[in-house]
């Protein structure tokens, strides 16, 4: 099926420039999933892009451009959760140190930890540099964004029967259309200045009644505060 | 072992339509899209088009809308190309290629290409 | 549609001695691009995936690199094995998976 040139994450659009600056980049040769900036020295993604060797690289906007506001900072330690499980992607968490403090400024700054869950209906921020086609594949330079509601748990359960564990929640559209993608894995879902969701998975992207699935951060809090404690 | 194995030659009459199988084996079937490439004797490789052979989603190269019909059977891990209205200069190599880095349900970045291939199956058009 | 040009058409090379075939997108593919050896009467494999990356089993004597628009596949010494004709392929961008027009190498 041919599928819309001007989609954007899916059914997104262009992020106005550095208008994401907690947005983070994991690069291997190559960008290969996004992160969330948390504090100096720590960014959030997810626990299935995980590899031995990251370049955390912040301040993006276009990936193929040195734009001038990136700073590139190799991981010092990357700590996948431990009840992490491939399989179902429960608990689809990680945490990456910095080997060395980013700059915080206007293009670079961090995201807050959630006080609360994420509540229905409220609408969020999906950001990363995924695939833009549905079917297919179309792969943008600058960072998409997309504005989606959280779903309730039992739309998110009866999307996808038996698979959606606590830990999980479902954002989007039942219509489809507008979704994550491959390549957005690890990046942000924010909703009121908070990170509610790191991007996990989905039955193919934009596809109707299969919206994007995402791990519920509020439910880590403790353990990433004391992952931090821990490694500082 | 993982392998594609694709029915035989062909030989068909302008104006005829021909079905080429190709049999998955030793993974699993619905987890990884499939392709189909030809090529013409003595030429490069051209592609046809894909299925999702979980969903039985298909994208086809433009210039085979509408005569090439891309469908699978879950229960045999077979996927079939059929190409209509043939012409002389359809007589070509047809191969089914695999799509490496299972369709996993992950939105990781994950590099593509097309790392298991058929033996392919020659198709001859001549009246 | 992306375009892929593949350079030289014909590449004569002896054995033991380095060759290095290009690839060029007509737009920024980044690093989506995967390169294919066949031989007379078989079916293409697959040697390097995500523009640099050896799939299994292939001799480290293969490699590839660039990102974007420009990639190189070099065979570092050629064996007897290597005379075959190698093609460059984009996932970057589609449908249309497309294809470069193939480099021949050949003994020289």
């Known amino acids: 099926a041919p599928f819309d040139d001007d989609d954007k994450i899916v059914g997104g659009y262009n992020c106005e420039e550095n208008s994401v600056p907690y947005q983070v980049s994991l690069n291997s040769g190559y960008h290969f999933c996004g992160g969330s900036l948390i504090n100096e020295q720590w960014v959030v993604s997810a626990g299935h892009c995980y590899k031995s060797r990251i370049q955390v690289r912040l301040g993006e906007h276009n990936i193929e451009v040195l734009e001038g506001n990136e700073q590139f900072i190799n991981a010092a330690k990357i700590i996948r959760h431990p009840q992490y499980d491939r399989k179902t992607l429960n608990n689809d968490i990680m945490l990456i140190k910095l080997s060395s403090r980013a700059v915080i400024n206007a293009r670079v700054s961090t995201i807050s930890l959630p006080t609360a869950p994420p509540a229905t209906g409220t609408k969020c921020l999906i950001s990363g540099w995924g695939n833009t086609a549905s079917s297919g594949a179309d792969y943008p330079d600058e960072l998409q964004c997309l504005d989606a509601p959280v779903l309730s748990q039992a739309k998110c359960e009866a999307s996808y029967p038996g698979k959606i564990t606590s830990n999980m929640f479902c954002v989007g559209f039942l219509e489809g259309g507008k979704d994550s993608c491959q390549g957005d894995s690890g990046g942000p879902v924010v909703c009121n200045g908070q990170l509610q969701g790191v991007v996990s998975w989905g039955d193919g992207c934009a596809q109707k009644n299969k919206p994007g699935v995402y791990t519920k951060v509020y439910n880590y809090v403790k353990w990433i505060k004391n992952t931090i404690a821990a490694n500082s | 072992q993982v392998q594609l194995v694709q029915s035989g030659a062909e030989v068909k009459k302008p104006g005829a339509s021909v079905k080429v199988s190709c049999k998955a084996s030793?993974?699993?079937?619905?987890?990884?899209?499939m392709h189909w490439v030809r090529q013409a004797p003595g030429q490069g490789l051209e592609w046809m088009g894909s299925?999702?052979?979980?969903?039985?989603?298909?994208n086809y190269a433009q210039k085979f809308q509408g005569r090439v019909t891309m469908t699978r059977d879950t229960s045999i891990s077979t996927a079939y190309m059929e190409l209509s209205r043939l012409r002389s200069d359809d007589t070509a190599v047809y191969y089914c290629?695999?799509?490496?880095?299972?369709?996993?349900?992950?939105?990781?970045?994950?590099?593509?290409?097309?790392?298991?291939w058929g033996q392919g199956t020659m198709v001859t058009v001549s009246s | 549609e992306i375009v892929m040009t593949q350079s030289p058409a014909t590449l004569s090379v002896s054995p033991g001695e380095r060759a290095t075939l290009s690839c060029r997108a007509s737009q920024s593919v980044g690093s989506n691009l995967a390169w294919y050896q066949q031989k007379p009467g078989q079916a293409p494999r697959l040697l390097i995936y995500?523009?640099?990356t050896r799939a299994t089993g292939i001799p480290a004597r293969f490699s590839g690199s660039g990102s974007g628009t420009e990639f190189t596949l070099t065979i570092s010494s050629l064996q007897s094995e290597d005379f075959a004709v190698y093609y460059c392929q984009q996932f970057h961008n589609w449908p249309p998976l497309t294809f470069g027009g193939g480099t021949k190498v050949e003994i020289k």
């Open positions: 290629a695999r799509v490496g880095g299972a369709a996993a349900a992950g939105k990781a970045y994950t590099a593509s290409a097309f790392d298991i």
């Open positions: 030793g993974y699993t079937f619905t987890g990884y899209y």
């Open positions: 299925i999702n052979p979980s969903s039985g989603g298909t």
């Open positions: 995500g523009a640099s």
